[in-house]
Amino acid sequence: LTCLGGFASPGPVPPSTALRELIEELVNITQNQKAPLCNGSMVWSINLTAGMYCAALESLINVSGCSAIEKTQRMLSGFCPHKVSAGQFSSLHVRDTKIEVAQFVKDLLLHLKKLFREGQFN
């Protein structure tokens, strides 16, 4: 999580701050959504459990050409300890269920807000 503040960061970003910033970005996406997010692209649904940050990134990284979620993809990479590339899938994906990116973001946002409220940052 130390790199989440970018090169200008004076030091490591506290996990709670990093999570709050990710939540705020997801809120921003949902509130500014006019046309269908990412042209209605579909992504694999994930289990919102341990390891979900990498799973979320693995799902979203397969969406290309969608500037609205690029910042989210970058932020999620800061929470995931390993490098994620397109086409990669973890056991956390619900491989028989695809949902729209907008719904994926909404579900992820709800879960992350509750993790923040409960003090679960990692």
């Epitope: 709670s16 807000k113 409220r117």
Partner: antibody, heavy 120, light 112 residues
Framework: EVQLVESGGGLVQPGGSLRLSCAAS????????IHWVRQAPGKGLEWVGR????????KYDPKFQGRFTISADNAKNSLYLQMNSLRAEDTAVYYC?????????????WGQGTLVTVSS | DIQMTQSPSSLSASVGDRVTITCRSS???????????LEWYQQKPGKAPKLLIY???NRFSGVPSRFSGSGSGTDFTLTISSLQPEDFATYYC?????????FGGGTKVEIK
Amino acid sequence: EVQLVESGGGLVQPGGSLRLSCAASGFNIKDTYIHWVRQAPGKGLEWVGRIDPANDNIKYDPKFQGRFTISADNAKNSLYLQMNSLRAEDTAVYYCARSEENWYDFFDYWGQGTLVTVSS
Amino acid sequence: DIQMTQSPSSLSASVGDRVTITCRSSQSIVHSNGNTYLEWYQQKPGKAPKLLIYKVSNRFSGVPSRFSGSGSGTDFTLTISSLQPEDFATYYCFQGSHIPYTFGGGTKVEIK
């Protein structure tokens, strides 16, 4: 319009059981936390516990753990408080309340309360 | 468990008076996410509580500006700058930072 409506209160004998309901409308219970709070006659407010209906994550005040059980039925958008081994000191008005939906910072809506009287 | 101690337990005041209610927690109620979930609720007889102040000093929407909250760490205050007839009620502080969440014992504000 957001609404919470409790029901199921009444007179019960010591040692008996009662199941309270909290019917929610105007929002999806999975989007927030629902709490149970009680108030004995002429006394202060007491937090009983809360549930996250999205994943059935439930927390109680330890004094109620074991005797009281909080649950949710997402299909019915309703919450429940199952109370067992009731004692006279459980006599109170029982409220359900929801955490506001943005950052869950506070209770923004409460039900009207339902009175539970434990007496022989 | 965190104890929330309110004082006074009751007070008599007149319309126009400045009223201060204090609440002390038995330990810090700063949450691990950095927020302090300290709220103030107003309750009138036979009614459900109503939120006045959240996160120590934030006034809830629709709450008159005469209500204000302050404090940090373990000591918190609710102030009513100029008491109005509709303010005669019981006031509770509440901490939602550490489970089990806890209410203060209440302060009943009565007409002098």
